[in-house]
């Protein structure tokens, strides 16, 4: 089909455009170009007869058009009026006509824009500023840049007037930036020079430096004042309310105790008309005092409170030192020193943070030490422990239980038997026990300062016969070659022997098997899948013996490297391909297939009927075990032969 392509489609005034003809028919008599979307003799630009190679201008010819033998039309020195449609009329040798229409658009080259502003010195938090991009140009897009970045999203920024106007509401000092506008149309883009917004602000509350307020007699006092302000602030100093001087710095050499007092800095902004003041109290010491430690919390609670220890007094140009337990400070993320080393903060105190703490002030001749301070950290009670740990006793013996819970202040203890209160002592003693003394023995520990209570319950069984033991495990599903498992034979009983069996046999000798805790605990290090066996523990004393039920260890392993069967890799065209993948794994692995890297199905068997040479390629089986977090795969190359005569080929399943 005959088509016209405009190169370019969007044309700048003064430039040229080529109307390029595609799919021009063979055997032509000639062709003619017209302005507009149809053939109109009054709007003919130029005609061309192939036989004579003669070009004839028409009524719409402007002298800027050149026609080429391939029917393409070049228009030079483009003007705005040239915008629109152009029709090519082709006359074939058989006098059958064909037409095609193309178009282009003409845009002016944009001038360099500039920014006008309605307020050259806006005041912070008060004024708005409207920037306008000049000149106003038809068919132009307006863009804005702040510090050469596109506009940030802000409710204080508003674009209007077709994006030609940028308004900043309630200007802040952070709006002081370089602003540029840009105009764009399809043929050009121009950026303005930058305009710097000068926001008047401040003064903010002045800061007096240095911060220290304690000085020694004979030192120089040199105070500096600064307040954020535009234009820069004018400064005045007052001592005890009396005006001193209009400077940013106040210098008093060789100060004495008489220079103690309140020092005020006043900052003034002549453009905004605002004043702000800051007062600091300066103390001049006749001689260095002995340091002492103040604390913001004298009874901190463990794991809850932080404690800030401050070395007093604050003295200029002084080095502060700290000691804990008569040692220099240990490195710890919970210990923080302030910039001047004067404050030591203990984050989230523990019972081990009691101290003692000392601080020191270093002067020219020596180090003055404070008195030591000890922290009274409140903690506990922790879970009480009842000792001894036996739970089985024979009739006739004495039962003596002791309870202890770490606590500050020390815990108060109570004993309960089967929920009934017995006594408020740390120890419980019952002589010559019988079966009736079996029951739940509870020790309750109470901290009067925190009001917290913790209890531990112990089941005591008084019996001549040993109970049936049971096995507890610290890991019910260990991962092969990674985890260890500790089996413990319960309960713990007095004067008892503990025994172990694996699959009905006594324990094999192995460096991975370890007995501990009086043979009550059996630990298997670095478990393997072969450890997935039945474990039984036994207890015996001079009166009786008993065995636990077996516990089978469920070892998670794999997936091992999968195997694809059958092993054949060459097949005849037309055969069925039936590949099965298997990998040892617990739990069973998730299977998935890829052919030439493309995911297929998630089944163990991959079946393709009537294969062809198109089925050639790499067949990968992937296996995954989420429980062990491990994956594995294997790749097999399959070749399908079109010929049925090649030797060694499988006919398939």
């Amino acid at each position: 089909k005959l088509t016209i392509e405009s190169t370019p489609f969007n044309v700048a005034e003064g430039k040229e455009v080529l109307l390029l003809v595609h799919n021009l028919p063979q055997h032509l008599f000639g062709y003619s170009w017209y302005k507009g979307e149809r053939v109109d003799g009054n709007r003919q630009i130029i005609g061309y007869v192939i036989g004579t190679q003669q070009a004839t201008p028409g009524p719409a010819y402007s002298g800027r058009e050149i026609i080429y033998p391939n029917a393409s039309l070049l228009i030079q020195n483009i003007i705005q009026n040239d915008t629109g449609f152009y029709t090519l009329h082709v006359i074939k040798s058989d006098l059958v006509n064909e037409e095609a229409t193309g178009q282009f658009r003409v845009y002016p080259e944009l001038p360099k824009p500039s920014i006008s502003s309605n307020n050259s010195k806006p005041v912070e938090d008060k004024d708005a500023v409207a920037f306008t991009c000049e000149p106003e140009t038809q068919d132009a897009t307006y863009l804005w840049w702040v510090n050469n970045q596109s506009l940030p999203v802000s409710p204080r920024l508003q674009l209007s007037n077709g994006n030609r106007t940028l308004t900043l509401f309630n200007v802040t000092r952070n709006d002081t930036a370089s602003y540029k506008c840009e105009t764009q149309n399809p043929v050009s883009a121009r950026r303005s020079d930058s305009v710097i917004l000068n926001v008047l602000y401040g003064p903010d509350a002045p800061t007096i430096s240095p911060l220290n307020t304690s000085y020694r007699s004979g030192e120089n006092l040199n105070l500096s004042c600064h307040a954020a302000s535009n234009p820069p602030a004018q400064y005045s100093w007052f001592v005890n309310g009396t005006f001193q001087q209009s400077t940013q710095e106040l210098f008093i050499p060789n100060i004495t105790v008489n220079n103690s007092g309140s020092y005020t800095c006043q900052a003034h902004n002549s453009d905004t008309g605002l004043n702000r003041t800051t007062v600091t109290t300066i103390t001049v010491y006749a001689e260095p005092p002995k340091p002492f430690i103040t604390s913001n919390n004298s009874n901190p609670v463990e794991d809850e409170d932080a404690v800030a220890l401050t070395c007093e007094p604050e003295i200029q140009n002084t080095t502060y030192l700290w000691w804990v337990n008569n040692q220099s400070l240990p490195v710890s993320p919970r210990l923080q020193l302030s910039n001047d080393n004067r404050t030591l903060t203990l984050l989230s105190v523990t019972r081990n943070d009691v101290g003692p703490y000392e601080c020191g002030i270093q002067n020219e001749l020596s180090v003055d030490h404070s008195d030591p301070v000890i922290l009274n950290v409140l903690y506990g009670p922790d879970d009480p422990t009842i000792s001894p740990s036996y739970t089985y006793y024979r009739p006739g013996v004495n039962l003596s239980l002791s309870c202890h819970a770490a606590s500050n202040p020390p815990a108060q203890y109570s004993w309960l038997i089967d929920g009934n209160i017995q006594q408020h002592t740390q120890e419980l003693f019952i002589s010559n026990i019988t079966e009736k003394n079996s029951g739940l023995y509870t020790c309750q520990a109470n901290n009067s300062a925190s009001g917290h209570s913790r209890t531990t319950v112990k089941t005591i069984t008084v019996s001549a016969e040993l109970p049936k033991p049971s096995i507890s495990s610290n890991n019910s599903k260990p991962v092969e070659d990674k985890d260890a498992v500790a089996f413990t034979c319960e309960p713990e009983a007095q004067n008892t022997t503990y025994l172990w069996w694996v699959n009905g046999q006594s324990l094999p000798v192995s460096p991975r098997l370890q007995l501990s805790n009086g043979n009550r605990t059996l630990t298997l290090f670095n478990v393997t899948r072969n450890d997935a066996r039945a474990y039984v523990c036994g207890i015996q004393n001079s009166v009786s013996a008993n065995r636990s039920d077996p516990v089978t260890l469920d070892v998670l392993y794999g997936p091992d490297t999968p195997i694809i069967s059958p092993p054949d890799s060459s097949y005849l065209s037309g055969a069925n391909l039936n590949l099965s993948c298997h990998s040892a794994s617990n739990p069973s692995p998730q299977y998935s297939w890829r052919i030439n890297g493309i995911p297929q199905q998630h089944t163990q068997v991959l079946f393709i009927a009537k294969i062809t040479p198109n089925n050639n390629g790499t067949y990968a089986c992937f296996v995954s075990n989420l429980a062990t977090g491990r994956n594995n795969s294997i790749v097999k190359s399959i070749t399908v032969s079109a010929s049925g005569t090649s030797p060694g080929l499988s006919a398939g399943a």
Partner: antibody, heavy 120, light 107 residues
């Protein structure tokens, strides 16, 4: 495309048995395991069991042991679920569903469901 | 058997809200957890498996996370077509068990 088409609704008396069928198409029948799940009116989903169409191996939830039987016919790519000794609490929509793969995968394609009503 | 507990049992949220449903297993199921969507009168539809793998064709506003015993289904921006009951299900060996479901409605 994968399709699981189940047999129509059934009304049964208490003590009777019901046999629901599920015909599979659009994939290799023996490659994927098929599960049965039921949903009582206004209730959640309850797993009944599954069958491996390749081998005929079945595994049932403890609750249904002794009352449920799952079978398959590879020639018609159909699985069957028979539930005996029906009681009113067995009234539910019974779904067959294909497992997304083999071993420890969820259920990706479901039948349209068969409403079984047990009423005297 | 492994018990699956879902919360909340129902929730009502506005279009565009971020919605979170949690599922807790009674024992470690590693990452073997699936999420289903069931619209009224329709069959359940698989959304997510292996705790976080999105099934092809499911909108990316659905996501899953978690491992061990605690899992979460998140709808980042609730749409009207998301009104349904959502079920979690462990696929760590049989018997498979489902959560009791969470009904999601639009305010």
């Amino acid at each position: 495309q994968v399709q699981l088409v189940q047999s129509g609704a059934e009304v049964k008396k208490p003590g009777a048995s019901v046999k629901v069928s599920c015909k599979a198409s659009g994939y290799i029948f023996t490659s994927y395991w098929l599960h049965w799940v039921r949903q009582a009116p206004g209730q959640g989903l309850e797993w009944i069991g599954y069958i491996n169409p390749q081998t005929g191996y079945t595994s049932y939830a403890q609750k249904f042991q002794g009352r449920v039987t799952m079978t398959r016919d590879t020639s018609t790519s159909t699985v069957y679920m028979e539930l005996s000794s029906l009681r009113s609490e067995d009234t539910a929509v019974y779904y067959c569903a294909r497992e997304y793969g083999n071993y420890n995968y969820p259920l990706d394609y479901w039948g349209q469901g068969t409403l079984v009503t047990v009423s005297s | 058997d492994i018990q699956m507990t879902q919360s909340p049992s129902s929730l009502s949220a506005s279009v565009g809200d971020r919605v979170t449903i949690t599922c807790r297993a009674s024992e470690n199921i590693y990452g073997y957890l699936a999420w289903y969507q069931q619209k009224p009168g329709k069959v359940p539809k698989l959304l997510i498996y292996n705790a976080k793998n999105l099934v092809e064709g499911v909108p990316s506003r659905f996501s899953g996370s978690g491992s061990g015993t605690d899992f979460t289904l998140t709808i980042s921006s609730l749409q009207p077509e998301d009104v349904a009951t959502y079920y979690c299900q462990h696929h760590y060996g049989t018997p498979y068990t489902f959560g009791q479901g969470t009904k999601v409605e639009i305010k």
